[in-house]
């Protein structure tokens, strides 16, 4: 297993609709044809997997059916979007990239993106 640098933004603020997007960029030492990207969430020293996708030559990442993630790839960049976030989901979201093929296997883990989620205030009752 060889190490690889992964860069991601330090902070992202989710939209009022609970959507957060960020770019995960990896320094590929060669031309990988198969890449696996995993988003991990770290909160209170616990790490959980949010979503994962293996992609090849296309530009759209395909996630499992119940996933809250979507994404696209371009070169060594992966554009990730996490949906359905609420205030309780605020935390550090870490991008993990694995170059699965061809050998050698490379692994890179980013420093994480702190995603802040603020639940929208309920609309006040209208007189109209």
């Amino acid at each position: 297993c060889k190490a690889m640098h992964v860069a991601q933004p330090a902070v992202v603020l989710a939209s009022s609709r609970g959507i957060a997007s960020f770019v995960c960029e990896y320094a590929s030492p060669g031309k990988a044809t198969e890449v696996r990207v995993t988003v991990l969430r770290q909160a209170d020293s616990q790490v959980t997997e949010v979503c994962a996708a293996t992609y090849m030559m296309g530009n759209e990442l395909t996630f499992l059916d119940d996933s809250i993630c979507t994404g696209t790839s371009s070169g060594n960049q992966v554009n990730l979007t996490i949906q359905g976030l609420r205030a309780m989901d605020t935390g550090l979201y870490i991008c993990k990239v694995e170059l699965m093929y061809p050998p050698p296997y490379y692994l890179g883990i980013g420093n994480g993106t702190q995603i802040y989620v603020i639940d929208p205030e309920p609309c006040p009752d209208s007189d109209f």
Partner: antibody
Framework: QVQLVQSGAEVKKPGASVKVSCKAS????????INWVRQAPGQGLEWMGR????????YYNEMFTGRVTMTRDTSTSTAYMELSSLRSEDTAVYYC????????WGQGTMVTVSS | DIQLTQSPSFLSASVGDRVTITCSAS?????IHWYQQKPGKAPKLLIY???TLASGVPPRFSGSGSGPEFTLTISSLQPEDFATYYC?????????FGQGTKLEIK
């Protein structure tokens, strides 16, 4: 030019297994997914699963989990799809298709399940 | 699973007509891809990533849309366009296809 050539038609009895092959040529086999799609007579297209030929990573349609196995042989640039516990409803044309965009397809393999 | 519903399922049209086929997803998807299939033949990729024409596909075919609603348009039908058309999504597993739209000669 890119080609996906599939094995010939099969007739199987219920409960048996079938293994269909898909030989790729004209491109780097390990750079693209191989997908398997089936089409029952007069029906639409149904995605069964896919394999990444380099690592062997597979994704299966849950509808077929436990019955389908996808493998590959990189030395011959051939992908395989095996379907077990066959029933009459599995009678269909089975296609392999390349990549994320299904931009090249095999000619199809007719599998008939009949007692 | 993401369901894709095509409308109409059957369409009768004449050479030279402009036709539009709609593909509606049960959940928002990033892209839609379109295939053409003729009887006894394997499907053929027409449009990928919603609006990009596959190699060798004539410009009378076009695709558009976003979120849950996408369309395939044929600006001026040619005799060779009479076939069945399928949309497909690959935002989430399992990859799914629409039920198909059969385009017939009026």
């Amino acid at each position: 030019q890119v080609q996906l050539v599939q094995s010939g038609a099969e007739v199987k009895k219920p409960g048996a297994s079938v293994k269909v092959s898909c030989k790729a040529s004209g491109y780097t086999f390990t750079s693209y997914w191989i997908n398997w799609v089936r089409q029952a007579p007069g029906q639409g297209l149904e995605w069964m699963g896919r394999i990444a030929p380099g690592s062997g990573t597979t994704y299966y349609n849950e509808m077929f989990t436990g019955r389908v196995t996808m493998t590959r042989d990189t030395s011959t640039s051939t992908a395989y799809m095996e379907l077990s516990s066959l029933r009459s409803e599995d009678t269909a044309v089975y296609y392999c298709a390349r990549g994320d965009y299904f931009d090249y397809w095999g000619q199809g393999t007719m599998v008939t399940v009949s007692s | 699973d993401i369901q894709l519903t095509q409308s109409p399922s059957f369409l009768s049209a004449s050479v030279g007509d402009r036709v539009t086929i709609t593909c509606s997803a049960s959940k928002s998807v990033s892209y839609i891809h379109w295939y053409q299939q003729k009887p006894g033949k394997a499907p053929k990729l027409l449009i990928y990533d919603t609006s990009t024409l596959a190699s060798g596909v004539p410009p009378r075919f076009s695709g558009s849309g976003s979120g849950p609603e996408f369309t395939l348009t044929i600006s001026s039908l040619q005799p060779e366009d009479f076939a069945t058309y399928y949309c497909q999504q690959r935002t989430t597993y399992p990859l799914t296809f629409g039920q198909g739209t059969k385009l017939e000669i009026k």
